[in-house]
């Protein structure tokens, strides 16, 4: 399976929600010794592979933020720990998952990594990622409300083994 | 890795200057760029900075006087109606986990003087 | 904002224990916004810790950042005479235009 990133680039202004969007493509094995993991964290941009640091959202980790379902099944986080954190992520049963950030702040700008992992009992597991940039302005350049830019479709394949 | 700021000299009050900040080994559309001065045995204050977008935000007291522009391996700041409590080294820093603040990478500074 | 330091000089001995305080008027970002730097006379500012606890790379381990919201702490153990120097907290607020840095804390070994 791939994960795509519909959008590389999202610009959005101070205060402004914004959900940031990956989706699973390809055969998705939905056997009972199949489970999907997935989870949303921070990394830096510049590193020579892309999405390999892991860093927090708003304090939360990569832990903190994961759904864990098999298959296609639709899922949330535990609301209370994100909400708190303005944060939310979700997974449908199309195989699009998200997190949704609210009331955007400048440091929330930076390059935020979606993450798959396949886990098969007793065999090995198999991870993709994908990863877009988010970034938040205020002031006369500002927009008035998210802007989306969407990736290549190269990008929007991205199956970096992590 | 590198960042370098260079166009520090001695000024008369009001005279306008830019200092330029030069980076290499890195791209300027991957990392934000933040300003910090120092004046002569005082502590660090933090001027602005630049996103990855190009927007640039400031620090209340540098706002309509300081202006923060870049090109594709450099940052300028651009300094209008100089005092002498301008009299200050100028660091120009790369900001590595975009915030405005965490500068990881940083140049040697740059003297600007402003006397009469 | 404002961040108040520990005042300076603080001295140490060679192979003892310092600790240097931040205190901010208001929270920072996330609660953890926060970095230590390190500056010795005539030289640019050094990144040690960001997010208030985590260390920069090649610092020393000897370095530790610890708190949340607005009380912070840099602890230096194992203290060298290399460690002299004068080191800053700074912070990053939801409102960048709160952005400050500590007014500087002077370590001195002994």
């Known amino acids: 399976f791939k994960v795509a990133t519909p959008y590389s680039l999202y610009v959005c202004p101070e205060g402004q929600n914004v959900t940031l969007t990956c989706r699973l493509l390809g055969p998705v094995d939905k056997g009972h010794d199949v489970t999907f993991y997935k989870t949303w964290y921070r990394s830096s941009r510049g590193e020579v592979q892309t999405c390999s640091e892991r860093r927090p959202i708003r304090n939360l980790t990569f832990q903190d933020l994961h759904l864990h379902h098999g298959g296609h099944q639709a899922a949330n986080t535990s609301h209370d720990l994100a909400q708190r954190h303005g944060l939310e992520s979700a997974s449908d049963h199309h195989g699009n998952f998200s997190i949704t950030m609210r009331n955007l702040t400048l440091l929330d700008s930076g390059l935020y990594c979606c993450l798959v992992v396949e886990i098969r009992h007793h065999h090995s597991e198999h991870r993709v990622h994908g990863a877009m940039e988010l970034q938040v302005q205020t002031g006369k350049d500002a927009p008035s409300n998210c802007v989306v830019y969407p990736s290549s479709s190269q990008d929007s394949e991205n199956i970096t083994a992590a | 890795q590198s960042v370098e700021e260079s166009g520090g000299r001695l000024v008369t009050p009001g005279t306008p200057l830019t200092l330029t900040c030069t980076v290499s080994?890195?791209?300027?559309?991957?990392?934000?760029m933040i300003w910090v001065r120092q004046a002569p045995g005082e502590g660090l204050e933090w001027i602005g900075f630049?996103?990855?977008?190009?927007s640039a935000y400031y620090a209340s007291w540098a706002k309509g006087r300081f202006t923060i522009s870049r090109t594709s391996t450099t940052v300028d700041l651009k300094m209008t109606s100089l005092t002498t409590e301008d009299t200050a080294t100028y660091f120009c820093?790369?900001?590595?986990?975009?915030?405005?603040?965490?500068?990881?990478?940083w140049g040697p500074g740059t003297l600007v003087t402003v006397s009469s | 904002a404002v961040l108040t330091q520990t005042p300076s000089p603080v001295s140490a001995a060679v192979g003892g224990t310092v600790s240097i305080s931040c205190q901010s008027s208001?929270?920072?970002?996330?609660?953890?916004?926060l970095s230590w730097y390190q500056q010795k006379p005539g030289q640019r500012p050094k990144l040690l810790i960001f997010?208030?606890?985590t260390l920069a790379s090649g610092v020393p381990s000897r370095f530790k950042g610890s708190g949340s919201g607005t009380q912070f702490t840099l602890t230096i153990s194992d203290v060298q005479c290399d460690d002299a120097a004068t080191y800053y907290c700074?912070?990053?607020?939801?409102?960048?235009?709160?952005?400050?840095f500590g007014g500087g804390t002077e370590v001195v070994v002994k």
């Open positions: 630049i996103n990855t977008g190009g």
């Open positions: 080994g890195f791209s300027l559309i991957s990392y934000w």
């Open positions: 700074a912070g990053a607020y939801t409102n960048y235009n709160d952005n400050a």
């Open positions: 208001k929270s920072v970002s996330d609660n953890n916004w």
């Open positions: 997010y208030a606890s």
């Open positions: 820093a790369r900001a590595r986990y975009d915030s405005y603040i965490t500068g990881d990478l």
